[in-house]
């Protein structure tokens, strides 16, 4: 997260760290007792590595009573996700068992109504991604509030030049932005999950290259079918 601040500890009990061989790889969001939603591209290079999900965490390194690492029983990338595009960049991870819920671990309601969030709406994005252009990784969860950007502006040639489909949304990126390591994490508007940080190699913090988020409402049928 660029231009953000440290989050209040455990105030986002839905927040997950998707880990590869014990190290933070991507963000994720608990959407059901046994399911975490993340980004499909996160597992592209995971091949033979061990994928796990950390829940109930604020610090990645310090012991915390609510922290627990879960093995992954099943990883379900969206069937249409492809390595070279940002489209359909969603991944559902089934935990090896139902998460132990509590004040620091709780699923987040997600948007089912397929309607665009109004431009200018302030939404919260959180993650353990890099906090500066030098690539410094934080130990504790960071967050930032970002205004939603209308899709037409996001599709301008000087922004994302037509790449933003109706299944994607954008948020402003003027110094405050999601960045590498935040992919798969939640964009939360009005207490509801609206978007998932896409995992492209986008430049961060440049206002002409807005953050891109997969709209969960556009994938309600797929999410429901996997969780069923």
């Amino acid at each position: 997260i660029l231009g953000g601040r440290e989050a209040e500890a455990h105030a986002r009990p839905y927040m997950a760290s998707v880990q590869l061989n014990g190290a933070h790889l991507c963000g994720g969001v608990l959407v059901a007792e046994q399911w975490v939603l993340s980004a499909a591209h996160c597992l592209e290079d995971a091949a033979d590595g061990k994928v796990q999900v950390l829940l109930g965490a604020h610090s990645l390194s310090q012991p915390e009573p609510s922290k627990r690492l879960y093995d992954v029983l099943r990883a379900v990338p969206h069937p249409d996700s492809q390595p070279d595009t940002i489209d359909h960049d969603l991944l559902l991870l089934q935990l090896s068992e139902k998460a132990t819920l509590g004040p620091a671990v709780r699923p987040l309601p997600w948007q089912r109504v397929d309607r665009d969030v109004a431009p200018g709406t302030l939404c919260d994005v959180a993650g353990w991604g890099i906090v500066n252009h030098a690539g410094r990784r934080p130990d504790s969860l960071q967050h930032v509030l970002l205004p939603v950007l209308d899709r037409a502006t996001c599709n301008r040639r000087t922004h994302h030049d037509g790449a933003i489909t109706e299944r994607l949304m954008c948020a402003e990126s003027n110094r405050r932005d999601s960045c590498k390591g935040d992919s798969g994490g939640p964009l939360v508007c009005g207490g509801v999950l609206e978007g998932v940080v896409t995992s492209g190699s986008r430049v961060c913090g440049n206002r002409k290259k807005p953050g891109i988020y997969t709209r969960v409402a556009s994938y309600a049928a797929w999410i429901d079918s996997v969780l069923a």
Partner: antibody
């Protein structure tokens, strides 16, 4: 398939007004800026300006700001170009073109002739 | 406003020829985001322009590989490696980096 269809061109007297329409189909109208470009007979392309179909924000080439106005009817997926105080030098083919990717999609153009 | 000057204004060539059109801008067209929004369009009589090249050197989908773009800063080039009968048309460079966006005056490619 993305389609842009202009209409409303024709013969108009100097000092007169005309409203051109650009009906879009095959895509979500509010997801892309609409631009207007004109081309005088035997001449090059000239950018008039653009409009954001979500916010209604406009940007005009200074040469056209006083006399030309953009508007929208999102329920009809249509953009409009209102032209006032027309002069002989406004005689041209007028195009609408979607921005994103680049100007990949254009209408067929509509001819406006300003003559007495 | 940024002026784009194309040269030549017209040229005569034969099928199979290598054709080069240049476009010079009155100031740099590197955008504040670091990209250069220099595009090339082809227009045939009575038709709307067609996008060939975007961001200096990227061919738009479906555009034959004989079309290529290059350049940086203020000097840009469109090259047709082996002219085909369907390539006889007028070519325009365009800059989208700075408002107002502007087109070059055009280069007409005619049959020799």
């Amino acid at each position: 398939e993305v389609q842009l269809v202009e209409s409303g061109g024709g013969l108009v007297q100097p000092g007169g007004s005309l409203r051109l329409s650009c009906a879009a189909s095959g895509y979500h109208f509010t997801s892309y800026y609409m631009n207007w470009v004109r081309q005088a007979p035997g001449k090059g392309l000239e950018w008039i300006g653009d409009i954001n179909p979500v916010t209604g924000d406009t940007d005009y080439n200074a040469d056209f700001k006083r006399r030309f106005t953009f508007s929208l009817d999102t329920s009809k997926s249509t953009a409009y170009l209102q032209m006032n105080s027309l002069r002989a030098e406004d005689t041209a083919v007028y195009y609408c073109t979607r921005e994103g990717p680049s100007f990949a999609y254009w209408g067929q153009g509509t001819l406006v002739t300003v003559s007495s | 406003d940024i002026q784009l000057t194309q040269s030549p204004s017209s040229l005569s060539a034969s099928v199979g020829d290598r054709v080069t059109i240049t476009c010079r801008s009155s100031q740099t067209i590197v955008h504040s985001n670091g990209d250069t929004y220099l595009e090339w369009y082809q227009q045939k009589p009575g038709k709307a322009p067609n996008l060939l090249i975007y961001k200096v050197s990227n061919r738009f989908s479906g555009v034959p590989s004989r079309f290529s773009g290059s350049g940086s800063g203020t000097d840009f080039t469109l090259t047709i490696s082996s002219l085909q009968p369907e390539d006889f048309a007028t070519y325009y460079c365009f800059q989208g980096s700075h408002v107002p966006v502007t087109f070059g005056q055009g280069t007409k490619v005619e049959i020799k």
